[in-house]
């Protein structure tokens, strides 16, 4: 989580701050959504359980050329302990279900808000 504050960060970002920043970014995406997010691209749905940060990144990293979610992809990589590359899938994906990126972001946002409320930051 150290890198989540960016290059100017004076030290490690507290986990609660990192999660709040990720929530803020997802809120920005949902608020600023004019046209269909990422041209209506579809991604694998995920189980919102332990390990879901990596699973979310694995899903979203397969969306290319969508500047709206680039910051989210970077932030999620800070929560995921291993390197994620396109085409990589974990058991947390609901492999028979694809949803629009906009719905994926909405579902992820709600879950992260609940984690924040419950004090589960990692």
């Amino acid at each position: 989580l150290t890198c989540l504050g960016g290059f100017a960060s004076p030290g490690p970002v507290p986990p609660s701050t990192a999660l709040r920043e990720l929530i803020e970014e997802l809120v920005n995406i949902t608020q600023n959504q004019k046209a269909p997010l990422c041209n209506g691209s579809m991604v694998w749905s995920i189980n919102l359980t332990a390990g879901m940060y990596c699973a979310a990144l694995e899903s979203l990293i397969n969306v290319s050329g969508c500047s709206a979610i680039e910051k989210t992809q970077r932030m999620l990589s800070g929560f995921c302990p291993h390197k994620v590359s396109a085409g990589q899938f974990s058991s947390l994906h609901v492999r028979d279900t694809k949803i629009e990126v906009a719905q994926f972001v909405k579902d992820l946002l709600l879950h992260l808000k609940k984690l924040f409320r419950e004090g589960q930051f990692n």
């Epitope: 609660s16 709040r20 709600l110 808000k113």
Partner: antibody, heavy 125, light 112 residues
């Protein structure tokens, strides 16, 4: 519009169980926490527990642990509270309430903003 | 468990009065995420409670501006700046920061 409609009044014998339902409309229960609060006659409010209907995770007050079970059925938008081993002091009005989130605020936990009408449970031999 | 103690337990006041109800928690109720989930509810006889204030001082939508909340740490207050006839009710504080979440015992506001 948002509504929480609870099941009707119940009269139960000591030692039996009661299951109270709370049917939600006007919102998705997976976007909420659903709470149960009770109020004995002439007494104050007592929080019993809550459920996250999206995953079934529950929190209970220790004094009710083992006697209370809170569940939710997303398909019917209904939350349930079951209380077992009833005793006379469980006579109370039982309320369900929700706490909701929206997509447009970073920190939008709105506490218990909508409540059911209450269900009177009377425990008497 | 965290105890929430309200004072006074009952209070007589007149329409137009400024009224303050206090709520003290037995320990600090700042949540690990930095928020303080201190809420105030109003209840009238035979009715379900209604949310007035959340997170110490945020007024819920539709709640008149005469209701305000303040405080920090362990000491909190609900103020009604100018009592209206419909404000006579019982008021409860509630902490949702540490499980088990707990209500205060209530403050009954009566007409003098």
């Amino acid at each position: 519009q948002v509504q929480l409609v609870q099941s009707g009044a119940e009269v139960k014998k000591p030692g039996s169980s009661v299951k109270v339902s709370c049917k939600a409309s006007g919102f998705y229960i997976k976007d909420t926490y659903m709470h149960w609060v009770r109020q004995a006659p002439g007494q104050g409010l007592e929080w019993m527990g809550t459920i996250d209907p999206a995953n079934g995770n529950t929190k209970y007050v220790p004094k009710f642990q083992g006697r209370v079970t809170i569940t939710a059925d997303e398909s019917t938008s209904t939350a349930y509270m079951e209380l077992s081993s009833l005793r006379s002091e469980d006579t109370a009005v039982y309320y369900c309430a929700r706490s909701i989130y929206d997509d447009y605020h970073v920190d939008d936990y709105y506490a218990m903003d909508y409540w059911g009408q209450g269900t009177l449970v009377t425990v008497s031999s | 468990d965290i105890q929430m103690t309200q004072s006074p337990s009952s209070l007589s006041a007149s329409v137009g009065d400024r009224v303050t109800i206090t709520c003290r928690s037995s320990q600090n109720i700042v949540h690990i995420n930095g928020n303080t989930y201190l809420e105030w509810y109003q209840q009238k006889p035979g009715k379900a409670p209604k949310l007035l204030i959340y997170k110490i001082s945020d007024r819920f939508s539709g709640v008149p501006s005469r209701f305000s909340g303040s405080g920090s740490g362990t000491d909190f207050t609900l103020t009604i700046s100018s009592l209206q006839p419909e404000d006579f009710a019982t008021y409860y504080c509630f902490q949702g920061s540490h499980v088990p979440w707990t209500f205060g015992q209530g403050t009954k506001l009566e007409i003098k």
